[in-house]
Interface confidence: low
């Protein structure tokens, strides 16, 4: 599709005469015909098969053509086609004398015709237009002319249809040979391919739209290119979707079971050193000075009891001092200017002459300590409850409270999570570092054996020659179904065949 | 369900006014170009007013410029038509109308109110 | 503003195809929306962007655009689509009608 554009310039007709030799009265009103036909070696009368314009009346006698085209007038002539263009035309310019306002053939006088003019050639679609004048005895007429395709078509033949859009199905505008170019953050044949944000992982992000980088299940980030862990992934990570690989020093399924609790929470205070003893349990071993599960109580250096013989302890800014009690005397007030004569033994201690009576020595009952039996004998100095136990007097004796995992007197007994029997349906239970595992008995799976699972029966194949074999789902086994021939629980045995008779 | 429903129409005497309102429900009005076109009685279809989804761009028919004026109240989800200097030939149905983007026309309609213009 | 003429009235036989034109200059740059409307209801989206069928529109509606005639065709005609039908343009902030073409099934 396309147009064949006519752009008339100017008309001699000095002598105002029609082609008859008759003037006209008062001067030549001229107006043209053209008609736009198909290559003719010779151009002859007939119908206008390219199409047909008429002007109104542009002038009389000589005068030069205005361009109206941008006024919306009908300069350039407009001849438009709706086929390919064959590169080929005839095209017949008729001037006609029009006396009155009537136009129509049948309304001219009927030598009406002024001249009349026929060319042919070859003409290429363009832009340019290509000049030419003719000249008969009296009229001259320059005109130019050229082929433009219609809005939407391209190509040398004006054959190529090409709309713009910006819709679902393409963002493109046209280019001069009808080729589509592409919006910016479009591609594909027809534009309908949006280009993603820059980086957009090929495989694992997509888009709807330019600059876009949307994600495939499993996949996270800007870019796509983040893998998501398994939902409920604590302290793990990934590198393919839904894994989840546990960072050091964590473990179980979803990476939450800590195994190295003294980096993770670093429990124990005081620069007091942090020993890990399984699952979220720890030791700590304290600095001289401190004390506590987690070495934070800072012990006074009276608390270590080190005056002896009843004396009392005084803290001072550079360690302590032992006020002694009569017959004492010393650092620790552990020289004594006491005899067995003196009593000296408390709480029923019995007392023992030493160095001929220079000295002496108490022998204490139990549940009382020091050198004259005068302290009260504290069961937990020694820090007897393992793996973080605290550990209690109870008069004559102690006891271990026991952290969460363990067991036992001094909470050295490590709890069986199988001691709970939570393996369902006769599944056996295996005590893990990390927790429990179950194996489960055929027909059952899940991680507590809870589920019931039917067991195919005839995955063995357990049918001969060649019997069909069925699952009986509410019992787990199998039933055989024999050919002909055959019998037995699984069609084991030939059934003796009839004898085969002569005739 | 998407619905658009006029009221506001009615009686009037030439040279009053009216003021016709569309409720919309069942999309997001606030995201929509919408418009109001009327039919008088026998004829087709003329084109009355359009609106951008935020009010701040508005064209009408020539027809009607300096007396119609349309409007819109988002919170609401509600279209308006303010007619002034009303005439006998603005008699008519005035529809209320969604016009979907990128050329796509107007692809939700209301069912319409009656203004009747009395001289 | 440019009219969009429609011819006011087109008969077709059931079964038969109908074909409603609407022209203007130029007609086949832009785009062309076509409605139906039915006595005493709303008029209803039946063409958009030149062919283009709304969802809910039977596939005998079809729809072209070139130079300046745009075509709305209804193949196989059916009595429930006797109604008046309407082509719609836009030119620049105006929004243009046709005069509406009466469709009769006979």
């Known amino acids: 599709s396309g147009v064949f554009q006519l752009q008339l310039q100017e008309f001699i007709n000095e002598r105002g005469v029609l082609a008859s030799g008759r003037p006209c009265e008062p001067g030549c009103r001229t107006f043209f015909r053209v008609c736009l036909k198909h290559f003719q070696a010779v151009v002859s009368p007939g119908p206008c098969t390219f199409g047909t314009v008429s002007t109104p009346v542009l002038g009389t006698n000589s005068f030069a053509v205005r361009d109206d085209s941008s006024g919306g007038g009908r300069n350039p002539l407009q001849l438009p086609f709706n086929f390919t263009w064959p590169g080929t035309f005839s095209l017949i310019i008729e001037a006609w004398h029009a006396p009155g306002d009537d136009l129509r053939p049948e309304a001219l006088p009927p030598d009406a015709l002024i001249s009349k003019i026929a060319i042919q050639g070859s003409l290429a679609v363009g832009q340019n237009w290509l000049l030419d004048e003719q000249t008969s005895t009296l009229t001259r007429l320059r005109y130019s002319y050229r082929v433009i395709c219609s809005d939407n078509y391209y190509g040398d033949n004006c054959s190529r249809l090409c709309k713009k859009r910006n819709d679902h199905f393409g963002h493109y505008v046209c280019q001069p040979d009808g080729n589509l170019s592409c919006l910016p953050g479009w591609t594909g044949e027809y534009c309908q391919q949006p280009i993603c944000l820059s980086g957009c992982h090929e495989q694992n992000g997509y888009c709807s739209k330019p600059a876009e980088c949307l994600c495939r299940p499993g996949w996270q980030g800007r870019l796509c290119n983040e893998c998501i862990p398994h939902n409920g992934c604590r302290h793990g990570t990934c590198s393919t979707p839904w894994q989840c690989t546990c960072d050091e020093g964590w473990g179980g399924l979803f990476c939450d079971q800590d195994l190295n609790y003294c980096t993770h929470h670093s429990p124990c205070k005081n620069g007091a050193t942090c020993s890990n003893s399984g699952q979220r349990s720890y030791t700590c071993t304290c600095r001289p000075g401190y004390t506590g599960v987690d070495c934070e109580l800072e012990l006074s250096e009276c608390d270590s009891n080190p005056c002896r013989n009843g004396g009392s302890c005084k803290d001072q800014e550079d360690g302590y001092h032992c006020l002694c009690p009569p017959g004492y005397y010393g650092l620790h007030c552990e020289h004594s200017t006491l005899s067995c004569a003196d009593s000296p033994c408390f709480n029923g201690g019995s007392c023992r002459e030493r160095n001929q009576g220079a000295n002496y020595a108490c022998e204490c009952p139990p549940n009382f300590t020091g050198s004259n039996c005068e302290k009260k004998v504290d069961r937990c100095t020694s820090n007897p409850c393992a793996n973080g136990g605290q550990c209690l007097n109870r008069g004559p004796s102690r006891m271990c409270r026991c952290r969460p995992g363990f067991t036992g007197t001094y909470c050295e007994l490590h709890v069986s999570d199988c001691a709970r029997n939570p393996c369902a349906h006769g599944g056996t239970c295996h005590d893990l570092e990390n927790g429990l595992m179950c194996t489960c008995p055929a027909g059952f799976s899940g991680r507590r054996c809870e589920v019931r699972t039917s067991i195919d029966a005839c995955a063995s194949s357990p049918c001969f020659n060649r019997a069909t074999c069925y699952t009986d789902l509410s019992t787990d086994t199998f039933v055989c179904n024999c050919p002909y021939g055959f019998v037995g629980s699984r069609c084991e045995f030939p059934v003796g065949l009839p004898p085969s008779f002569p005739w | 369900e998407v619905q658009l429903l006029e009221s506001g129409g009615g009686l009037v005497k030439s040279g009053g006014s009216l003021r016709l309102s569309c409720a919309a429900s069942?999309?997001?009005?606030?995201?929509?170009?919408m418009s109001w076109v009327r039919q008088a009685p026998g004829k087709g279809l003329e084109w009355v007013a359009i609106?951008?989804?935020?009010?701040?761009?508005?064209y009408s028919a020539d027809s009607v410029k300096g007396r119609f004026t349309i409007s819109r109240d988002n919170s609401k989800n509600t279209l308006y038509l303010q007619l002034n200097s009303l005439r006998a030939e603005d008699t008519a149905v005035y529809y209320c109308?969604?016009?979907?983007?990128?050329?796509?026309?107007?692809?939700?309609w209301g069912q319409g109110t009656m203004v009747t213009v009395s001289s | 503003l440019p009219v969009l003429t429609q011819p006011p009235s087109v008969s077709v036989s059931p079964g038969q195809t109908a074909s409603i034109t609407c022209s203007a200059d130029?007609?086949?740059?832009?785009?062309v929306s076509w409605y139906q409307q039915k006595p005493g209801q709303s008029p209803v989206l039946v063409i958009y962007q030149d062919a283009k069928r709304p969802s809910g529109i039977p596939e005998r509606f079809s729809g072209s655009n070139s130079g300046n005639t745009a075509t709305l065709t209804i193949s196989g005609t059916q009595t429930m689509d006797e109604a008046d039908y309407l082509c719609?343009?836009?030119?620049?902030?105006?929004?243009?009608f046709g005069g509406g073409t009466k469709v009769t099934v006979l």
């Open positions: 719609q343009s836009w030119d620049r902030s105006d929004v243009v």
């Open positions: 069942g999309f997001t009005f606030r995201s929509h170009w």
């Open positions: 609106i951008s989804y935020d009010g701040s761009n508005k």
């Open positions: 109308a969604k016009a979907g983007g990128g050329n796509v026309g107007f692809d939700i």
């Open positions: 130029k007609l086949g740059t832009k785009y």
